[in-house]
Interface confidence: medium
């Protein structure tokens, strides 16, 4: 789970070891702060749960691509 130390910096200390189907994801943000021990991606699910993931993993990259495309495609 994401952790806030001296908010507003949020860091990830552990990554999920399970994939999450892209349709369950609502958004993501990258964690690149030097105050954090590792770079990370935090996904927010459609039920507003936040999950830390490893940006080096293919499923994480696929998911970010998917969400990027979703935001670029206006809903009609």
């Amino acid at each position: 789970q994401p952790d806030a130390i001296n908010a507003p910096v949020t860091c990830c200390y552990n990554f999920t070891n399970r994939k999450i189907s892209v349709q369950r994801l609502a958004s993501y943000r990258r964690i690149t702060s030097s105050k954090c021990p590792k770079e990370a991606v935090i996904f927010k699910t459609i039920v507003a749960k936040e999950i830390c993931a490893d940006p080096k993993q293919k499923w994480v990259q696929d998911s970010m691509d998917h969400l990027d495309k979703q935001t670029q495609t206006p809903k009609t």
């Epitope: 994939k19 999450i20 189907s21 892209v22 349709q23 369950r24 293919k58 499923w59 990259q61 696929d62």
Partner: antibody, heavy 122, light 107 residues
Framework: QVQLVESGGGLVQPGGSLRLSCAAS????????MSWVRQAPGKGLEWVSS??????????SYAASVKGRFTISRDNSKNTLYLQMNSLRAEDTAVYYC?????????????WGQGTLVTVSS | DIELTQPPSVSVAPGQTARISCSGD??????VYWYQQKPGQAPVLVIY???NRPSGIPERFSGSNSGNTATLTISGTQAEDEADYYC??????????FGGGTKLTVL
């Protein structure tokens, strides 16, 4: 343990119809996507169709070769997957396997049924 | 769809290492899965997510994937490993693409 049992195969004339069933047990059916994969005699594996899980509102997808002719569906109350095959052609002759998957779009098949043979011939 | 190419056949002596390749455009950016199929039987998943073995699959099976090529490696090949092997990847919306299959013969 996970079990997938196909049925409904048989001999059908070109232009005819057939409905395949796949009875699932040993897992929470609605939480998994399900697919049909076929294998023509002496040939390789060919993905036919998928129906996703509850997280994706059971979205469906089809191979170009069957789109408009085949319809995939599922009955979660019966733990059963279906494939309605219409306007059958000789090239649809194959063993049809049902298989389950968990994640999308990283679709891979961790359990398979033993298959049911569909023969399209006059 | 992603097009996957496998050699039709590979031969190996018992106890030796068998390598089966699967090539496709930028395949290294996708996960690759491998299945073993013996005559008259359904396929069995032997490798998932490039290099992971499902429980019950012997340690002699391993996988790798980078660039345009994924490889299934069987170390210390045994007679029971004689089978057809298929690689598989995915595109969008739960569609799957299979390679043409490779017949592994244990001499």
């Amino acid at each position: 343990q996970v079990q997938l049992v196909e049925s409904g195969g048989g001999l059908v004339q070109p232009g005819g119809s057939l409905r395949l069933s796949c009875a699932a047990s040993g897992f929470t059916f609605r939480s998994y996507g399900m697919s049909w994969v076929r294998q023509a005699p002496g040939k390789g594996l060919e993905w036919v169709s998928s129906i996703e899980h509850k997280w994706t509102n059971y979205a469906t997808s089809y191979a170009a070769s069957v789109k408009g002719r085949f319809t995939i569906s599922r009955d979660n109350s019966k733990n059963t997957l279906y494939l309605q095959m219409n306007s059958l052609r000789a090239e649809d002759t194959a063993v049809y396997y049902c298989a389950r998957f968990e994640f999308t779009p990283w679709t891979y098949f961790d359990f398979w049924g033993q298959g049911t043979l569909v023969t399209v011939s006059s | 769809d992603i097009e996957l190419t496998q050699p039709p056949s590979v031969s190996v002596a018992p106890g030796q290492t068998a390598r089966i390749s699967c090539s496709g455009d930028n395949l290294g950016k996708k996960y690759v899965y491998w299945y073993q199929q013996k005559p008259g039987q359904a396929p069995v998943l032997v490798i998932y997510d490039d290099d992971n073995r499902p429980s019950g699959i012997p340690e002699r099976f391993s996988g790798s994937n980078s660039g345009n090529t994924a490889t299934l490696t069987i170390s210390g090949t045994q007679a029971e490993d004689e089978a057809d092997y298929y690689c598989q990847s995915y595109t969008a919306q739960s569609s799957a693409s299979f390679g043409g299959g490779t017949k592994l013969t244990v001499l």
